[in-house]
């Protein structure tokens, strides 16, 4: 039960995280005009990864896309790339994790296959989350650098003779959405990796034993027995199998023709 819950929760957390990464990538408010010392200008500027917007005091908002690729700063291109890689990896991870979910049965998929898929999706979520966090952090660092540069310029314009009012930009809502979303995706990925450990059959010192009766050959299957640790009393009536250490919710009931995918 714990493994299923961990896997399910990991999936849901990652799903929310990736939705957040997509939202952050699409948002226009990556950087917003700094209004700390009251509004200096009568317009409010904010910028995203794809376009910049200006909101007039009347509420009228006009946005312009960055219709150039080569003219954009390398850092902005890098942030775009990181966010897109994060989204793509996350989307693939989600797709893989859907099939890996223990509560969903597909044919006669082995636990080991589900464990591998869970691990794969978990790693994908971790990398996706790291990409998003890295992208947002790079952009934030860019903003901090520019903020202090423009602050310095405010007071040192032309040898202090001219004081220029500069528009400074600070962290927009998208950065916080991105950080939180990246963190959630990362956590979801870790949870998936933890769930994978519970799904994967544990290696023991015993190998599966085939018992040959005198008249005919019988191979015992694990499905026919109640899960047991294989230790302690009453072991003589039980066979020790590869991965005999199982929790009750991990007992596999094999799909019949009445089971639905």
């Amino acid at each position: 039960m714990a493994v299923t819950a961990c896997q399910g929760l990991g999936f849901v957390v990652s799903l929310i995280g990736i939705a957040g990464i997509i939202a952050a990538t699409c948002m226009d408010q990556w950087s917003t005009q700094d209004l700390y010392n009251n509004p200096v200008t009568a317009v409010f500027n904010y910028q995203g990864l794809w376009r910049s917007c200006v909101r007039e005091s009347s509420g009228f908002t006009e946005c312009r896309g960055y219709f150039t690729l080569l003219g954009l700063p390398a850092m902005l291109q890098a942030v775009r790339a990181l966010m897109i890689v994060g989204i793509v990896l996350g989307a693939i991870g989600l797709l893989v994790s859907i099939f890996a979910l223990k509560c969903i049965r597909i044919g006669s998929m082995e636990d080991s296959a589900k464990a591998n898929m869970t691990l794969t999706s978990g790693i994908m979520f971790i990398v996706s989350g790291l990409c998003a966090i890295a992208g947002v952090s790079v952009f934030a660092n860019m903003l901090v650098t520019n903020f202090w540069m423009s602050t310095a310029n405010m007071y040192t314009g032309m040898g202090g003779m001219v004081q220029t009012v500069q528009t400074r930009y600070t962290f927009g809502a998208a950065l916080f959405v991105g950080w939180v979303a990246g963190g959630l995706t990362l956590i979801g990925g870790v949870m998936m990796c933890i769930a994978c450990r519970g799904l994967a059959p544990e290696e023991t010192n015993y190998k599966a034993v085939s018992y040959h009766a005198s008249g005919h050959s019988v191979a015992y299957k694990p499905g026919g027995f109640k899960a047991s640790t294989g230790f302690g009393s009453n072991t003589k009536n039980k066979k020790i199998y590869d991965g005999g250490a199982r929790t009750e919710d991990e007992v596999q009931s094999y799909p019949s023709k009445h089971d639905y995918v």
Epitope: N45, V54, E56, S58, R64, V165
Partner: antibody
Framework: QVQLQQPGTELVKPGASVKVSCKAS????????MHWVKQRPGQGLEWIGR????????NYNQKFKGKATLTVDKSSDTAYMQLNSLTSEDSAVYYC????????????WGQGTLVTVSA | DIVMTQSPSPLTVTAGEKVTMTCKSS????????????LTWYQQKPGQPPKLLIY???TRESGVPDRFTGSGSGTDFTLTINSVQAEDLAVYYC?????????FGSGTKLEIR
Amino acid sequence: QVQLQQPGTELVKPGASVKVSCKASGYTFTTYWMHWVKQRPGQGLEWIGRIRPSDSDSNYNQKFKGKATLTVDKSSDTAYMQLNSLTSEDSAVYYCAMGAYFSNSFAYWGQGTLVTVSA
Amino acid sequence: DIVMTQSPSPLTVTAGEKVTMTCKSSQTLLNRGNQKNYLTWYQQKPGQPPKLLIYWASTRESGVPDRFTGSGSGTDFTLTINSVQAEDLAVYYCQNDYFFPFTFGSGTKLEIR
């Protein structure tokens, strides 16, 4: 069509206060900023401040803070500017002007109220 | 505060002539976010309130004759009247509507010979 109606003149004594009104019609009053501008006889224009009728948010020219107070009455679509502690320096024509939607310019102006401060 | 400097004043011309008046701001009125210059031109005829002519430095307000043209960017702006008419007798003000407080130029008085 858009109209901003202001009283023609206001005669007040030095030290007193005056409340100049500006009744708006022909548009949705709460949508646009209302600006106030001062013009002394034979002189240029000075921006006093602006108020957004929807939430009474306002911006003032620092020079007029404490001198002018902008308010609105949404029920009657009227904007008001109260001038306190009047002196002869405050004798001027005061215009209300409706802010444009696309830009920050003043699209429509009232006819102006001549405030005369005299003993 | 942003200082708006207008010249010349007064400006005496003959009807039909092309007129150019300038306005300089102490700081750039160009907003990089939308590449717009927040400069407005108003016309004030004697005994009347000002009337909006041009906003965003070059966008003509609806109903304004096309003989009025605004140009310029950053700190230097120009209002051109292509063929002056007798009814254009007025004071023309430029206004910074980008920085608070909004400030006006001292005006250019257009006189017809």
